[in-house]
């Protein structure tokens, strides 16, 4: 078992004549995610066939506006990696199809009007465990940059993430017909627990290394589909002439799910309700203790020292499921205020302020003079979703509330003194200059610098600067 | 601009057959994360959904109906079939079909785009 | 199954009222959606995935909740909001909906 990561890095116009026009406009605002399909082998990159290595999908990214006129630049993306886990055996050869697609935000008639704006696929070869791959694929005018990689979960290790490694039972070997983990080799390998490829909705196992199928399905790897030979039905011959109108066997059929599982079907899979004591796609995990990591993204796993006595999981926030394995829609709770858009990061939840709020849940307001007061004769200036006090002289600070020392910076020139003034500031200026802040020499000859001192005011004065 | 259209016969008789067609336009079959449902609705009563097919031919049918159900698509032709055999006047109802939309790969995002329903009487 | 229990049955209101409905499923669900009928025309969709407002929805629809328990809110009703409402879940087959809310004009 592994996951595989996709990083975007850009999403905008390729080089070269015919610049795309923008997804988005002023009074069609929208916003960018993108989804990602996996396949194993070099297969076709036809987008109907199933993402039999999984599917990903990303957050929504930044609302974005196009200004008029203005050519299609890199557009806002989504935070944070696509992630696909897959649980099998990397395959080493993939193809994938990586879509973008933009989310309108205008008032639209019916539901969220989503539309496809590029499609990008390909094949190729990656080790699970390898550095970022980086890629840039381009569909029409559009380009699209990115980088990926597939890392095994623990306890898989390998290429392939097939090779199982736990913590030795004994400090000296592994048990019989086990060989050290290399590189780790204070731990062992473990035996793979179905074969490498097996069809996880259409396959099973029950000893390690099998791959059994479920009604419907044959093959080593149980992904090919039993042909319907004829319409003997429980339903009778269909007179369609497209042939013969048997459904396909669901995913329920025949019960994949071991240990006395219950199983439902989803919108497109199924899902094991599992016993205590069993875990797995399947349930078919047993015999669990925490030595085994039972619990998911980080749960942490009480109890259960011996195979008999049950193990209890306590899950991080974000995580819930008796092993910590599902998710909680966090963001459905909506706890950003004030029209904020709520990211589920996964560790944490952020929330992306509208413009005039602030905080971690945008609960503070920054927004307006409306009822807020500068103090000491202080002007209240609105910008940018905020406002700001522009202060009389001698006063500063967010509210205008603090005096502030014209003197603190030292104004007065060439080591003249500075005194406060309910007006300013005055420097008194040391012997042979003179100026509103001493800046100018007065001449041996008595003659300044300057054309003429101000009327009352004689060179050497202290200067009050206005 | 999204559209869903049933179509099919008002009035069949007990133990036939229904076979109802949904045609739509301003999306297609062929692009992933689309689906197509069928839901129904008894006079008076809830609505009840049927069956739905996606687009890389994942099928999924009401339990207590299954025996009685087949729904095909022809990509080609923007079009979603749905078969009914054994028709009981239990089954009178308005018949819609709607826009399924799967981003994530069983999460269904919305059923966003309904047709204007079919009312079928079965009655001999 | 998974049962979809809606209450009230029935609700009588007035315009400017805040109005809240409920509908509890009888399994956890991961999200919750939510469709206003009005008779003789078919059902449109209001809220996806819990709490996001399908477009051309008015503001003062809003939905929460989560597990087995959740809510649609109508914060200041509408002369056009009198209809019946619908929740449903998309967990697991049947994905089966709620027996309906009828917002009535008091």
């Known amino acids: 078992a592994g996951v595989f990561e996709l990083q975007i890095h850009s999403f905008g116009p390729g080089p070269g004549p015919g610049a795309p026009r923008s997804p988005c406009s002023a009074r069609l605002p929208c916003r960018l995610f993108f989804r990602v399909c996996l396949k194993p082998g070099l297969s076709e990159e036809a987008a109907e066939s199933p993402c039999a290595l999984g599917a990903a999908l990303s957050a929504r990214g930044p609302v974005y506006t196009e200004q008029p006129g203005a050519p299609a630049p890199d557009l806002p993306l989504p935070d944070g990696l696509l992630q696909v886990p897959f649980r099998d055996a990397w395959p080493g050869t993939f193809s994938f199809i990586i879509e973008t697609w933009r989310e309108e935000l205008g008032d639209q008639i019916g539901g969220p009007a989503w539309s496809l704006l590029a499609r990008v696929a390909g094949r190729r070869r990656l080790a699970a465990g390898g550095p970022w791959a980086r890629d840039i694929q381009r569909a029409g005018a559009w380009e699209l940059r990115f980088s990926y990689r597939a890392r095994c979960e623990p306890p898989a290790v390998g290429t392939a993430c097939t090779r199982l490694c736990r913590p030795r039972s004994a400090p000296s070997r592994c048990g019989p017909g086990l060989r050290p983990c290399a590189p780790l080799e204070d731990e062992c390998e473990a035996p793979l627990v179905c074969r490498a490829g097996c069809s996880p909705e259409h396959g099973f196992c029950e000893q390690p290394g099998e791959c059994r199928c479920l009604e419907g399905w044959t093959g080593p790897l149980c992904t090919v589909p039993v042909s319907t030979s004829s319409c003997l039905s429980p339903r009778g011959p269909s007179s369609a002439t497209t042939g013969c109108l048997v459904p396909g066997p669901g995913p329920c059929d025949g019960n994949p799910c071991a240990n006395g599982g219950s199983c439902s079907e989803t919108p497109r899979s199924f899902e094991c309700t599992c016993p205590r004591g069993f875990y797995g796609l399947r349930c078919e995990v047993s015999g669990v203790t925490c030595a085994d990591g039972p619990c998911f993204n980080g749960g942490l796993c009480v109890g259960g020292a011996d195979p008999d006595s049950a193990y209890i999981c306590h899950c991080p926030p974000g995580f819930q499921g008796s092993n910590c394995e599902k998710r909680v829609d966090r963001c459905s709770l909506q706890p950003c205020r004030n029209g904020g858009l709520c990211l589920d990061l996964g560790h944490a939840l952020r929330c992306r302020c509208r413009a005039g709020f602030a905080g971690p849940r945008c609960e503070h307001d920054l927004d307006d003079c409306a009822g807020r007061a500068c103090a000491n004769g202080g002007t209240c200036v609105e910008g940018g979703g905020a406002h700001r006090c522009s202060c009389a002289l001698g006063f500063g600070g967010r509210d205008c509330r603090e005096r502030a020392d014209p003197c603190a910076a030292r104004p007065c020139a060439h080591g003249g003194r500075c005194y406060a003034h309910f007006s300013g500031l005055v420097c008194a200026c040391a012997p042979g200059y003179m100026g509103a802040r001493c800046e100018f020499p007065v001449h041996p000859d008595g003659a300044s610098a300057l054309p003429a001192a101000p009327p009352g005011l004689r060179p050497g004065d202290p200067q009050r600067y206005l | 601009q999204i559209t869903l259209k049933e179509s099919g016969p008002t009035l069949v008789k007990p133990t036939q057959t229904l076979t109802l067609t949904c045609t739509f336009s301003?999306?297609?079959?062929?692009?992933?994360?689309?689906?197509v449902g069928w839901i129904r609705q008894p006079p008076g009563k809830a609505l009840e959904w049927l069956a739905h097919?996606?687009?890389?031919?994942?099928?999924r049918y009401s339990p207590s109906l299954k025996s009685r159900l087949t729904i095909t698509k022809d990509t080609s032709k923007n079009q979603v079939v749905l078969t009914m055999t054994n028709m009981d006047p239990v089954d009178t109802a308005t018949y819609y079909c709607?826009?399924?939309?799967?981003?994530?790969?069983?999460?269904?995002?919305?059923?966003?785009?309904w047709g204007q329903g079919t009312l079928v009487t079965v009655s001999s | 199954d998974i049962q979809m229990t809606q209450s009230p049955s029935s609700l009588s209101a007035s315009v400017g009222d805040r109005v809240t409905i409920t509908c509890s499923a009888s399994?956890?669900?991961?999200?919750m959606y939510w469709y206003q009928q009005k008779p003789g025309k078919a059902p449109k969709l209001l809220i996806y995935?819990?709490?996001n407002l399908a477009s051309g929805v008015p503001s003062r629809f809003s939905g929460s909740g989560s597990g087995t328990d959740f809510t649609l809110t109508i914060s200041s009703l509408q002369p056009e909001d009198f209809a019946t409402y619908y929740c449903?879940?998309?967990?697991?087959?049947?994905?089966?909906f709620g027996q309906g809310t009828k917002l009535e004009i008091k």
């Open positions: 097919i996606w687009w890389d031919d994942v099928k």
């Open positions: 301003g999306f297609s079959l062929s692009t992933s994360g689309m689906g």
């Open positions: 709607a826009r399924i939309v799967s981003f994530d790969n069983d999460v269904v995002s919305a059923m966003d785009y």
């Open positions: 995935l819990t709490s």
């Open positions: 399994h956890s669900v991961s999200y």
């Open positions: 449903q879940q998309w967990r697991s087959n049947p994905f089966t």
